[in-house]
């Protein structure tokens, strides 16, 4: 502890410029005073001044005002420091002496005599109020005033809280008049060293170095630190915790960048064909009559499909077609004939069989020809039975589709996994994505197909965190942290209780 | 009972950059009442105080080093750096790391043993 | 900058009080730690806050400041004491350290 117990010395009387043995002062009583501050005693004694002492020069002859003083000598009030908790109890000696000799130090000088003592005990506590007294005896009279105060930095009842006002970043506060630290705006904690964060910004996700700031933490974005970062590279995908990649409805794969409903995104058949998605970026698109091509953006000659029957020749018409009919037959398509079984209309050794009475025929064909007089081979491809681009071709009495490259299938209908071809070697884990197969390698080896083996191997130093499995060879120089269940990040460092997560591209 | 200890380099040479780290064992850097400090000690002479940083990256320097220093920290491995750019042959000190307590109003209550770095071609 | 001058040296007899002073403009309003150095070995605070001893630390240290100057006392000192001691500063961010007094 540490304070200051002030006296203020006001007025001293002493009309007859007597002493205390009842001699006069010749020529008159030149006074100066000795304080002596001691612990409380019932009854005062002798002994050392155990709260300190002062004397004064020589303040005036007989009666005299004292004035105040703020400093040098004759410093009124005088100051008795101390260096311990106030007890809030005191004994305090003044005695009033005269002096025949020097006027600044009289302590020093020999035959200096008594006037008058007064001598104070009692309780003070600490304050700014001054206790204002007045001690008479038979010569002489002192009017006086005293408090204790505390020295700077120091607070409380006692004095005994030492407090200074700091604003660094151990703290940032001021002093309370009981000696409690009072935070500046923006700053809490027990030492005012922490900072009040940007209202709103997550408790967890975000923290701050200084007052109204919102830091992220790693996964964390947005100005309050409460939108999670998704996966890197997700594209068409959310997350709910960080570094997670939920796909958007239609989309798949690691990245939700493989289109699982390409026909609803991106509308690839033309002329109002049916479209059917089948698998990542895969679709077939079905053509209506009069159209063929992969996207059935290829208009038909409206003879294409053979309209004219019997033999009859087709002929293209702005939006139409004419049949011209051979003899014996007529109709839009040369459908009705006039000729019977008499007339042998059946070609490619067909058999006529006579109908209505014999008015009209009809031909029986042999295998691979058609047509109402078997006048027609069979071409088994006119019904573009191929889809996915496969080309159709003829084999005798059959057909077959050739496939474009990742369709198989009798009609080239499926769509060939790219990781099928198990294109890893050394043990590569293959993925499917929208540019061909990606392969993650084991530690050692790299390269597109994992085909490179490595001096140097970025899995040796053990980068990944929590237990994962490192890879090698997503990208040249990289590895690939497997994180366990519940941690994430680029070496699977931060435990967040998620689901287990896909590989991270360290 | 908390421990620091320094590792790096014991050479350096002119020009190039000086790197330190600090491990922390026995108690958590991420504890908010402390700030994790470099100080430095030519041979012969006084303590430098250099800088330090608190758990979530605030760093707080000496201006006259300002320039030069960087600090860093890495709470998943319990470690604090220091990296010194361009040095020459007065950087030649041990250094120490300390933490301070914000309880201690910044007093230094734990330091680790010092390494001792010498600038030199 | 801010600065803080210590003796270079300060004598004393076993048993007796030793006094190391430590002064700086308006040093009585900053908070003063005080270190104590051994050869060869790092710096052990002694005092903090001025005045305050940590666990561990004799009550034969003390420690006061006010106006410009703070004071580290060791009194009943013991040839175990004989050290270099340093006072320590926060001026605004900066950590500042006194020049080190040898006690002998």
């Known amino acids: 502890g540490s304070g200051i117990f002030q006296l203020r010395l006001q007025e001293f009387v002493n009309q007859r410029g007597m002493l205390a043995n009842g001699q006069s002062c010749e020529p008159g009583c030149r006074t100066f005073f000795r304080i002596c501050l001691k612990h409380f005693q019932a009854t005062f004694s002798e002994g050392p001044c155990t709260f300190g002492n002062v004397s004064t020069p020589v303040l005036g002859t007989n009666s005299f005002v004292v004035r105040d003083k703020n400093s040098g000598s004759g410093r009124n009030p005088l100051q008795l420091p101390f260096n311990f908790t106030w007890p809030g109890t005191f004994s305090l000696n003044i005695q009033a002496w005269h002096t025949p000799g020097d006027d600044l130090r009289p302590e020093t000088s020999p035959g200096n005599s008594l006037i008058s003592q007064i001598i104070i005990q009692g309780s003070l506590a600490v304050g700014k109020i001054w206790r204002t007294d007045e001690q008479n005896d038979t010569l002489t009279r002192l009017s006086y005033s005293y408090r204790v105060i505390c020295s700077d930095n120091y607070y409380g009842e006692s004095c005994s809280r030492l407090c200074k006002k700091r604003d660094d970043h151990f703290g940032h506060y001021e002093c309370q008049p009981d000696g409690s630290l009072s935070c500046l705006p923006g700053w809490t904690g027990k030492y005012c060293d922490q900072p009040i964060c940007l209202s709103g910004c997550h408790e967890q996700n975000g923290y701050c170095s200084k007052p109204d700031e919102c830091i992220c933490r790693p996964g964390w974005q947005g100005r309050l630190c409460n939108e999670c970062i998704p996966h890197n590279g997700c594209r068409h995908g959310t997350c709910s915790i960080p570094w997670q990649c939920a796909c958007d409805e239609g989309w798949g794969g690691l990245f939700c960048d493989q289109d699982l409903n390409y026909c609803t995104h991106h509308s690839p058949c033309k002329n109002g064909s049916t479209c059917s998605n089948s698998g990542p970026k895969g679709y077939t698109c079905t053509c209506l009559p009069g159209y063929t091509g992969e996207h059935c953006e290829l208009g038909l000659s409206k003879c294409a499909s053979n309209p004219c029957r019997n033999g009859g020749s087709c002929k293209d018409q702005e939006n139409s077609y004419h049949c011209l009919c051979p003899p014996g037959y007529y109709g839009q398509h040369c459908e009705h004939s006039t000729l019977t079984c008499a007339d042998s209309p059946c070609f490619n050794g067909g058999s006529c069989r006579e109908r209505n009475q014999g008015s009209s025929y009809a031909c029986e064909c042999p295998p691979n020809f058609t047509g109402s007089n078997c006048e027609k081979k069979v071409d088994r491809c006119t019904s573009n039975p191929c889809a996915n681009g496969g080309q159709c071709q003829n084999r005798g009495p059959s057909r077959t589709c050739r496939c474009r490259p990742g369709f198989t299938g009798t009609h080239c209908e499926l769509h060939i996994s790219d990781c099928a071809r198990s294109p890893c070697a050394h043990g590569g884990t293959c993925h499917d994505l929208e540019n061909g197969p990606v392969c993650t390698c084991p530690a050692g080896f790299s390269g597109r197909r994992c085909e490179v083996r490595i001096t140097h191997d970025a899995c040796a130093s053990g980068p990944c965190f929590n237990g994962a499995t490192c890879y090698t060879g997503l990208s040249p120089n990289n590895f690939v942290c497997n994180c366990p269940y519940g941690f994430v990040g680029s070496r699977c460092e931060f435990p967040v209780g998620l689901p287990p997560s896909f590989p991270w591209v360290a | 009972e908390v421990q620091l200890q320094e590792s790096g380099p014991g050479l350096v040479k002119p020009s190039e950059t000086l790197s330190l780290t600090c491990t922390v064992s026995?108690?958590?850097?991420?504890?908010?009442?402390?700030?994790w400090g470099w100080i430095r000690q030519p041979p012969g002479k006084g303590l430098e105080w250099i800088g330090d940083?608190?758990?979530?990256?605030?760093?707080y320097y000496n201006p006259s080093l300002k320039s030069r220093v960087t600090i860093s920290v890495d709470t998943s491995k319990n470690q604090f750096s220091l990296k010194l750019s361009s040095v020459t042959a007065a950087d030649t000190a041990v250094y120490y790391c300390?933490?301070?307590?914000?309880?201690?109003?910044?007093?230094?209550?734990?330091w680790g043993q010092g390494t001792l770095v010498t600038v030199s071609s | 900058s801010y600065e803080l001058t210590q003796p270079p040296s300060v004598s004393v007899s076993p048993g007796q009080t030793a006094s190391i002073t430590c002064s700086g403009d308006?040093?009585?309003?900053?908070?003063v730690s005080w270190y104590q150095q051994k050869p060869g070995q790092s710096p052990v605070l002694v005092i903090y806050?001025?005045?305050e001893r940590p666990s561990g630390i004799p009550e034969r240290f003390s420690g006061s400041n006010s106006g410009d100057t703070a004071t580290l006392t060791i009194s009943g000192t013991q040839a175990m004491d004989e050290a270099d001691y340093y006072c320590?500063?926060?001026?605004?961010?900066?950590?500042?350290f006194g020049s080190g007094t040898k006690v002998t």
């Open positions: 300390a933490r301070q307590a914000v309880m201690y109003g910044g007093g230094s209550d734990n």
């Open positions: 026995g108690g958590s850097i991420s504890s908010g009442s402390y700030y």
């Open positions: 940083i608190y758990y979530t990256g605030s760093t």
């Open positions: 308006s040093l009585g309003d900053k908070y």
């Open positions: 806050e001025d005045s």
């Open positions: 320590q500063a926060w001026d605004s961010e900066t950590g500042v």
